[in-house]
């Protein structure tokens, strides 16, 4: 019965960008300005999102799609559809409740967002530290001490970091 009723529902013919207007014998009316319907068969249009304050408009609203926001400089998007803007920090920092704080020794952050992560523990891969880590950069692991025996012809490129962990100090 439900299936049959939905097939006979005149509102199901209303395409995206319109709504089924009960005040006008359920004819399909265009969404009013500043509103949209992204699917067919809608009984109302949704009000467009305003991208202001810490947000700014990435894409304006249309009758069939909501506005898309991004964040003003110094902030970055979080959440589905950029539902929040979070303050950027510098590389080598992470955002805490008290603001941006430097990464603790043994951790790094090479982005303006996210948390400080531990340096790679080269010894877990049987390798040695080729380049020390900093607040902004992970350590670079080099060949294992055995590979550096006399007669070794070249230094092999560092393997990609696999497992986080503290490097030996």
């Amino acid at each position: 019965f439900e299936r049959t009723r939905s097939l006979q529902d005149p509102c199901s013919n209303c395409p995206a960008g319109t709504f089924c207007d009960n005040n006008r014998n359920q004819i399909c009316s265009p969404c009013p300005p500043n509103s949209f319907s992204s699917a067919g068969g809608q009984r109302t249009c949704d009000i467009c999102r305003q991208c202001k304050g810490v947000f700014r408009t990435r894409k304006e609203c249309s009758s069939t799609s909501n506005a898309e926001c991004d964040c003003t400089p110094g902030f970055h998007c979080l959440g589905a559809g950029c539902s929040m803007c979070e303050q950027d920090c510098k590389q080598g920092q992470e955002l805490t409740k008290k603001g941006c704080k430097d990464c603790c020794f043994g951790t790094f952050n090479d982005q303006k967002r996210g948390i400080c992560r531990p340096w790679t523990n080269c010894s877990l891969d049987g390798k040695s530290v080729l380049v020390n880590g900093t607040k902004e950069r992970d350590v670079v692991c080099g060949p294992s001490p055995a590979d550096l025996s006399p007669g070794a012809s070249s230094v092999t490129p560092p393997a990609p970091a696999r497992e986080p962990g503290h490097s030996p100090q």
């Epitope: 300005p33 500043n34 009000i47 305003q50 991208c51 202001k52 700014r56 408009t57 990435r58 894409k59 304006e60 249309s62 799609s65 898309e68 991004d70 400089p73």
Partner: antibody
Amino acid sequence: EVQLVETGGGLVQPNGSLKLSCAASGFIFNTNAMNWVRQAPGKGLEWIARIRSKINNYATYYADSVKDRFTISRDDSQSMLYLQMNNLKTEDTGMYYCNWDEAYWGQGTLVTVSA
Amino acid sequence: DIQMTQSSSYLSVSLGGRVTVTCKASDHINNWLAWYQQKPGNAPRLLIFGATSLETGVPSRFSGSASGNDYTLTITSLQTEDVATYYCQQYWSIPYTFGGGTKLEIK
């Protein structure tokens, strides 16, 4: 950083023409609507034109005071907004601002219509 | 067209005092109202959007409120740098319209 820089203002005689430009940077221009707002000397602000983006078929809107005389247009490849002003009247004298998203304004370009 | 009426063209104010600037819309604007501050020789600066939301970087002494079609900008503890002209604007319905402006003058 968002920047809107208007150019093209100047002195023009009544019934003359002028084309204003606005160079936009620091945001995604081609998916955003843009406005022109003007201000006569010592007077208030007046919205005069709006152009929407491709997703809205570049729809244009005008204040009654400039309809059929002014034309708003855009060049998305250059992130440029334009205002072609024809049949200028003395009452069109003022500072013309390019505006995006209510929050962002250029420094304005001065148009003087005088014999 | 929707008319935006700012009943006071001028307000005589005291530094450190509280100021309210009012604006009335002739029709429903769904709170799509902006308040701007403008100083001589400068472009307008957005203070409030959506009738009540403070724009980034604007001091918290500025606030906006709405009641029906009546809108208010409030400045608590007025500072010398707040002496300017304030405009409301509706951006709900084209043509977008501004109020006539309210100029603050020091007593």
